[in-house]
Structures are given as C-alpha cells and as structure tokens.
Interface confidence: low
C-alpha cells in the first residue's frame, strides 16, 4: 500500500531513496515547454518477480508546440551507469540497487524529463538523510526514515539526524562515517504494543504495502 | 528505560491559569514529537495539543485553541502545556506523550500513535 504523507523534514538536510520498493510510483512530469504525449503512461511503476525487479511504463515528453515530435524515452542499461540522477546521489551507496530483491534502482532521465521528480512511496520504503553543504550531523544516529504501518495507519520514523552549521558536512552511509544503516533489517508486521525500552528511533520495516509523494530535486 | 514526568496540576477556578511540564529521561528526547492528551471522567483519552522535535509545527485541539500552548525546551529535555482561560469542561487527568511522528497541519494525533506516555497529572477546574 502506499505511504499517506512525505517522509519527514529537517532543517538543512535532505533525503534520498536509494532504492525503490516495488509498487513505487513515479510521476511522467515534463519541464516547462513540454508534455507528456496524448497516449504516454502517466507514470512508471517498479515492479518485478522473485528474481528482478524494472521500472514498467515509459515517460515521454513531447513540446508543447508541436503535435508530432515525441522525444526519446528511457536510455539504455549502458547510459544509466553514466548518469548522474540527484545532487543527493552519493557514489558509495548503502545498498547495491542492482541486487536488492524487491527494488528497483533510481530511475533513468528521460528527454524534457522536469527538474523534480514526484514519486509515490510503498509502506517499508526507506529513505537516508545526509545534511546539505556547509552543515555537519550535530547527532548522530539512524539517519534514515521508514514508512511504516500502524494500526492501519501509514506514517514515517523520524530520522535522528540534527545538522548544525559549521563546515564540515556529513555524508550517506558509507561514504563518511556511517549514520546507522544496520544490515539484515527484518521486515516485519508493527506490533501495536510497543515494548522497548530504548528512547531511540525505531526504523524497522513493515511487511505490508500501503502511497506518499515525495518531490526530489533532479539535475 | 524511557520515562515522562508530568507536573503542574492541581485546582483552579474557571477562568484561571496552570502550567503543565513534562520532563523526559532516559533517552533522545530532541528527536521526538511530543504531545499532550486528557482524559475526563468517563470518556475517551483525546488529544490536545502537539509539537515537532524541530518546533516547526504546533497542533492544537479545536476546543483548545486559543487559550492552550504548547512549546518545549530541548536543551532541557521538557514539554510544557501552559493552559489559560480554564473551563470546567478542561478538568481531566493530563498525559504527556513521545513519539516519532511527522507532525502535519492536516492531522490530528490519535492515542494509538504514541509510543511513550507519562502516568498523567490531574487538573480540576471549579465554577
């Protein structure tokens, strides 16, 4: 199912997926002075069996101007090696997209492709926080946000991420010091009783599927 | 282990002022929303007023808005409910509240949402 609201804001950082769980939505948004063509798909859905998982649908943007010209859609395996997606895209990630079951990697561009990117987020979707140039994490801890399941109820950890303004900036997990990015995170059904009893932020995965949108900058 | 204290109540006729604080232990106490709920004779435990970690958003109930504040200090680990123009109707057992949720304009916390709560402070309002 998906996620009701965004993951969570704070102060001076900014978050990235590094990885999309099937049933993720991304919206075919054209930048201004293009549309998407009469019969293109509204969005691409990542979606996949046991063994793969791939972006279904393509966007394509054509000028606003003219009603013939349909622009190129998604590039090759090749090209999206090459590519450079968000200003939060980090060149050691947490996770190898290409081998993490169930998920899709960040989307290629497409031709007219518009500078934000909405996507749509599935319950046990998790996003790494990092604090943007010129701050630093002032604490440090699972710098990540789940959305989760609760009592029927979709929401989001919140991150233990406070970024402070001095020079020196932090980074996703693995490239620094790491946040907190625990391997081997279970998915698993939220008990409504909650029994621990550490103050910490819990970022376990739900099981279940219910959407948020989520707007990301994109050079 | 995760506590919240609360303190502050007592008597007070209609009309007139308390303060409640709320003082964490135990744990990150900066990171989290925090709330307060009451629960009257009788009826079910309902929401009154919440904050974000980052202070950026404030929640009020309808029947408390305009004479609740919320505001916290996180230096000092503490959530305070400064509460004017007291109605009878305001008399109930008052319970702080933690939990990790993203605060937004459009929503209004429900007890199920809370992870952590205090044993509640008493608050009695006379006409």
């Known amino acids: 199912e998906l996620c009701d609201d965004d993951p969570p804001e704070i102060p001076h950082a900014t978050f990235k997926a590094m990885a999309y769980k099937e049933g993720t939505m991304l919206n075919c948004e054209c930048k201004r002075g293009f549309r998407r063509i009469k019969s293109g798909s509204l969005y691409m859905l990542c979606t996949g069996n046991s063994s793969h998982s791939s972006w279904d649908n393509q966007c394509q943007c054509t000028s606003s101007a003219t009603r013939n010209t349909t622009k190129q859609v998604t590039p090759q395996p090749e090209e999206q090696k090459e590519r450079k997606t968000t200003e939060m895209q980090s060149p050691m990630q947490p996770v190898d997209q290409a081998s993490l079951p169930g998920h899709c990697r960040e989307p290629p561009p497409w031709e007219n492709e518009a500078t934000e990117r909405i996507y749509h987020f599935v319950v046990g979707q998790m996003v790494y926080y990092q604090c943007v140039q010129g701050y630093r994490a002032l604490h440090r801890g699972p710098a990540e946000s789940v959305c989760k399941m609760t009592h029927g109820k979709t929401r989001w950890t919140q991150p233990q991420l406070i970024c402070t303004g001095e020079m020196e900036t932090s980074q996703f997990p693995g490239e620094e010091k790491p946040q907190a990015s625990p391997e081997g995170r279970p998915e698993s059904e939220t008990s409504c009783l909650v029994t621990t009893t550490d103050f910490q932020i819990q970022t376990e995965m739900a099981a279940t599927m219910e959407t948020s949108i989520f707007t990301t900058e994109y050079q | 282990q995760v506590q919240l204290v609360e303190s502050g109540g007592g008597l007070v006729q209609a009309g007139g002022s308390l303060r409640l604080s709320c003082a964490a232990s135990?744990?990150?106490?900066?990171?989290?929303?925090m709330g307060w709920f009451r629960r009257a004779p009788g009826k079910e435990r309902e929401f009154v007023a919440a904050?974000?970690?980052?202070?950026?958003?404030?929640l009020y109930a309808d029947s408390v808005k305009g004479r609740f504040t919320i505001s916290r200090d996180n230096g000092r680990n503490m959530v305070y409910l400064q509460m004017n123009s007291l109605k009878p109707e305001d008399t109930a057992v008052y319970y702080c509240?933690?939990?990790?949720?993203?605060?937004?304009?459009?929503?209004?916390?429900?007890?199920?949402?809370?992870?952590?709560w205090g044993q509640g402070t008493q608050v009695t309002v006379s006409s």
């Open positions: 904050v974000s970690w980052n202070v950026d958003n404030k």
């Open positions: 135990g744990g990150t106490f900066r990171t989290r929303n």
């Open positions: 509240a933690a939990d990790n949720i993203p605060l937004s304009s459009d929503m209004r916390p429900t007890a199920t949402e809370y992870d952590y």
